[in-house]
Each structure stands twice: as structure tokens, then as C-alpha cells.
């Protein structure tokens, strides 16, 4: 017999972390950001 379809509520297909730094000119500083991207 074929199984009845019971879906799970969600699946995380992939998740990536990207770090970036940006020079802010004469301030000699950096802005560090963390971007989280996920597909649900």
C-alpha cells in the first residue's frame, strides 16, 4: 500500500552566514555585519 501523505511543517533547505566589513573612510573604522539568509 502507498503511504498517505503527511507533510512536515517546514524544512530548512539551506542556511548561510556571510561576514562583511566596510571601510568608512577617514574614521578608520569598520562596520561589521552579520547576514543570515535562510529559505523556509
Amino acid at each position: 500500500d502507498a503511504e498517505f501523505r503527511h507533510d512536515s511543517g517546514y524544512e530548512v533547505h539551506h542556511q548561510k552566514l556571510v561576514f562583511f566589513a566596510e571601510d568608512v573612510g577617514s574614521n578608520k573604522g569598520a562596520i561589521i555585519g552579520l547576514m543570515v539568509g535562510g529559505v523556509v
Epitope: D1, A2, E3, F4, R5, H6, D7, S8, G9, Y10
Partner: antibody, heavy 121, light 112 residues
Framework: QVTLKESGPGILQPSQTLSLTCSFS??????????VSWIRQPSGKGLEWLAH???????RYNPSLKSRLTISKDTSRNQVFLKITSVDTADTATYYC?????????????WGAGTTVTVSS | DVVMTQTPLSLPVSLGDQASISCRSS???????????LHWYLQKPGQSPKLLIY???NRFFGVPDRFSGSGSGTDFTLKISRVEAEDLGVYFC?????????FGAGTKLELK
């Protein structure tokens, strides 16, 4: 509050097509995981599952009746339909629709009160 | 089709008794996702079935704790610890692991 209500012709003759409607409230068939099944029960006997329709219009049928069954839905009107062709006296039964709630429950939690269908010449 | 065999078909009890109903399936009800889709319903005369227990042992909302479900694979049991008058009716087990979905023939819980 989830409610379902079945409606049908009451009486029809052999060889005719039975058309049933399940009108529901308290949930939407556009919601991921939701579904509705049709189940029937001859008087004083057991339960027989007929067909199921999912929120995404995927369908499942009882293989023993598949050639005679068509399930469909009107999401905007909160209705599910079942057609049974070439009916015979063996199709005389109370017909129920039931709400299927998916993840994380995966159960048929609420049934309608049923509509009685008699096939007689 | 998966055949659901319930025993007994009739169960005479006195109020306050413990009642036990067995349900056996012709094949394992463990779905490929790991869940076991075995459920119990109570149907009273002139009414539609009402869900009591889902996925073997989970009580549905509002179901008294005198109802409990257990089992695994192909062998399942519904127990009522102290039968009350409102518990009388026909109990059905049901599997939703395979197509077609199937039901047991029912167990009628009645007074002695």
C-alpha cells in the same frame, strides 16, 4: 470554532451520479497542511474512507472506488465536493466529511454531522 | 488494504469498571517519517465519530485522562480506567499511515 456540514440529494436512483457538498468554517483550505476527507457509513455498519483533498489540490482516492470518485474544492467558498458516478444500492449510507489538520498533529479532528443518502429505484 | 481487527466487538461493563479494547493491524503502522498514525474515535448513536486519541497515545483536546492509548507496530490498546455513562458507544480504531485509510469494525461499549 471548526465546523463542517454535508449536504446531498437525499434520495437518488441507481446509475445516477451522486453529488455531495461539504461546507466548512473555522479554517481555510488555503492554509498549508489542511485537508478534507470524505468517509461513509452504511446504517449500523462500519466506516469506509473514500477520498481526500489537500490544501495544495493534491488528491487521494480509495483504490476500490477510484474509477467512480472525483473530489474537488472551492477554496474561496470554503467548500469541498465529492461526485460518485453510477451509484447502486450499496452506496446507500451516511456520508461524512472530516477536517484533516497537518503538522504537528496529522489527524482528522472534526467531522460533520453527516448527510444520509439513499439509492433506491 | 491494511486490515484493522478490533476485539472484542462487544464489551459489557458496569459503571466504574476498567475497559480495554484491542486493535491489531495487518501490517506495521510506522510511517516513513517515523510517526505511527493509529487513532481512536468514539461514536454515539445518531452522531458522527469524535476523536479521542491520536498517534497511538495522545489525548485530543478535552478528552478526560481516564482515556489512554498505547501500543506500537501492529498492536494497540485503548483503556478506560473508570467507565462513566457518557463513555458508552462504539469505539473505532483507525489508521492513516497507508492509502486507503481504514477503520476497525468497532467495539460497542455497553452496560451489563
Amino acid at each position: 470554532q471548526v465546523t463542517l456540514k454535508e449536504s446531498g440529494p437525499g434520495i437518488l436512483q441507481p446509475s445516477q451520479t451522486l453529488s455531495l457538498t461539504c461546507s466548512f468554517s473555522g479554517f481555510s483550505l488555503s492554509t498549508s497542511g489542511m485537508g478534507v476527507s470524505w468517509i461513509r457509513q452504511p446504517s449500523g455498519k462500519g466506516l469506509e474512507w473514500l477520498a481526500h483533498i489537500y490544501w495544495d489540490d493534491d488528491k487521494r482516492y480509495n483504490p476500490s472506488l477510484k474509477s467512480r470518485l472525483t473530489i474537488s474544492k472551492d477554496t474561496s467558498r470554503n467548500q469541498v465536493f465529492l461526485k460518485i458516478t453510477s451509484v447502486d444500492t450499496a452506496d446507500t449510507a451516511t456520508y461524512y466529511c472530516a477536517r484533516y489538520d497537518g503538522y504537528p498533529y496529522w489527524y482528522f479532528d472534526v467531522w460533520g454531522a453527516g448527510t444520509t443518502v439513499t439509492v433506491s429505484s | 488494504d491494511v486490515v484493522m481487527t478490533q476485539t472484542p466487538l462487544s464489551l459489557p461493563v458496569s459503571l466504574g469498571d476498567q475497559a480495554s479494547i484491542s486493535c491489531r493491524s495487518s501490517q506495521s503502522l510506522v510511517h516513513s517519517n517515523g510517526n505511527t498514525y493509529l487513532h481512536w474515535y468514539l461514536q454515539k448513536p445518531g452522531q458522527s465519530p469524535k476523536l479521542l486519541i491520536y498517534k497511538v497515545s495522545n489525548r485530543f483536546f478535552g478528552v478526560p485522562d481516564r482515556f489512554s492509548g498505547s501500543g506500537s507496530g501492529t498492536d494497540f490498546t485503548l483503556k478506560i480506567s473508570r467507565v462513566e455513562a457518557e463513555d458508552l458507544g462504539v469505539y473505532f480504531c483507525s489508521q492513516t499511515t497507508y492509502v486507503p485509510l481504514t477503520f476497525g469494525a468497532g467495539t460497542k461499549l455497553e452496560l451489563k
